[in-house]
C-alpha cells in the first residue's frame, strides 16, 4: 500500500511481488519524488484500491504501456 | 537531497579512451536507472544510454553501440561512461541523470570533453 | 528511433507574453514527453513529464498539453528567469530521443 508522507507526497516502500491482469487495472501514476526511497508505479485497480508496483519490471512496464495506449483511444 | 556530482574535464586525443564518473548522494543508485546524455557545443541534447544498477542491465542508442560501455558501482553509488575511438565529433559536455521511467529528474553537473589533437 | 521535432527554434518575447513551443513525434508517444528547461552552462532542469505532471517546485505558469505526436509547452506569463532554451524529449521508447531545442530570448 502507498504511504502518504505529508498531504502532497505518497511514497512506495514495498513492492507487490504479484503480477497483477491488465483487466483489473484502471489507472497509474508515477512516483518519482526524490521525498522517497524509491521511484514507483502506483496502479489503482478498477475497485479503487491502490497498489505499489516496481517500474524496473518488464509486467509493470509492459501494464503502463497498455494504460497509456487505451487512455489515448477514443472508447466506441 | 539527490546530487549527482561528476568528474571534471577532460581534453583527450583522437583514438583515444576517455571515462567519465558519476557519484550519486542522496539516493541508492540500484532503485534507480543511471543515464547518459551528452551535449556537443551550442548543439541539442543526445541520450547515450542507461544501466540498471541493481543487475548491471545497460541499453544504448545504437549510435554508440560498441564504442561506449556503461558501469556503475552500487558500493560507492558511482556510474561510469566510457567512450572509445574518440574523434572530434566527440568534443561535448557529457551528463549523467537519474530515473527509472526514461525521463531525467536529477542531473549531473556535467563534464566537458575536448577532443583534439 | 522517435523522431521530435521542435519549433520554433527561436523566438523574442516580452515579460508577461504568453509563449508557447511545440514538439511534433513521428509517430504516436502516447504522452510520454517530458519538457526541461536549459540555461547556459548549467544542466537541463526537469519542468513537466507525462500528461499534465509539473515537477515539484515548478511553477504553475508552465504547463503542458497534447496527445499522439503533437505536444505543446505554455508559459502563460512569461518572467524574467523563463529566459532559456527548452527542450521536449519521448520516452516512449528507447533510444530516448529530444527536440533540437527552442530559444526564448528577451524582445
Known amino acids: 500500500q502507498p504511504d502518504a508522507i505529508n498531504a502532497a507526497v505518497t511514497c512506495c516502500y514495498n513492492f507487490t511481488n504479484r503480477k497483477i491482469s491488465v483487466q483489473r487495472l484502471a489507472s497509474y501514476r508515477r512516483i518519482t519524488s526524490s521525498k522517497c526511497p524509491k521511484e514507483a508505479v502506483i496502479f489503482k485497480t478498477i475497485v479503487a484500491k491502490e497498489i505499489c508496483a516496481d517500474p524496473k519490471q518488464k509486467w509493470v512496464q509492459d501494464s503502463m504501456d497498455h494504460l497509456d495506449k487505451q487512455t489515448q483511444t477514443p472508447k466506441t | 537531497q539527490v546530487q549527482l556530482v561528476q568528474s571534471g574535464a577532460e581534453v583527450k586525443k583522437p583514438g583515444s579512451s576517455v571515462k567519465v564518473s558519476c557519484k550519486a548522494s542522496?539516493?541508492?543508485?540500484?532503485?534507480?536507472?543511471m543515464h547518459w546524455v551528452r551535449q556537443a557545443p551550442g548543439q541539442g541534447l543526445e541520450w547515450m544510454g542507461r544501466?540498471?544498477?541493481?543487475?548491471?542491465?545497460?541499453k544504448f542508442d545504437p549510435k554508440f553501440q560498441g564504442r561506449v560501455t556503461i558501469t556503475a558501482d552500487t558500493s560507492t553509488s558511482t556510474a561510469y561512461m566510457e567512450l572509445s575511438s574518440l574523434r572530434s565529433e566527440d568534443t561535448a559536455v557529457y551528463y549523467c541523470?537519474?530515473?527509472?521511467?526514461?525521463?531525467?529528474?536529477?542531473w549531473g553537473q556535467g563534464t566537458t570533453v575536448t577532443v583534439s589533437s | 528511433d522517435i523522431q521530435m521535432t521542435q519549433s520554433p527554434s527561436s523566438l523574442s518575447a516580452s515579460v508577461g507574453d504568453r509563449v508557447t513551443i511545440t514538439c511534433k513525434a513521428f509517430e504516436d508517444i502516447y504522452n510520454r514527453r517530458a519538457w526541461y528547461q536549459q540555461k547556459p552552462g548549467k544542466a537541463p532542469k526537469l519542468l513537466i513529464h507525462g500528461a499534465t505532471s509539473l515537477e515539484h517546485g515548478v511553477p504553475s505558469r508552465f504547463s503542458g498539453s497534447g496527445s499522439g505526436t503533437d505536444y505543446t509547452l505554455t508559459i502563460s506569463s512569461l518572467q524574467p528567469e523563463d529566459f532559456a532554451t527548452y527542450y521536449c524529449?519521448?520516452?516512449?521508447?528507447?533510444?530516448?530521443?529530444f527536440g533540437g531545442g527552442t530559444k526564448v530570448e528577451i524582445k
Open positions: 542522496g539516493l541508492t543508485i540500484s532503485h534507480t536507472y
Open positions: 541523470a537519474r530515473g527509472v521511467f526514461g525521463f531525467f529528474e536529477h
Open positions: 524529449q519521448q520516452f516512449w521508447s528507447a533510444p530516448y530521443t
Open positions: 544501466i540498471d544498477p541493481e543487475n548491471h542491465n545497460t
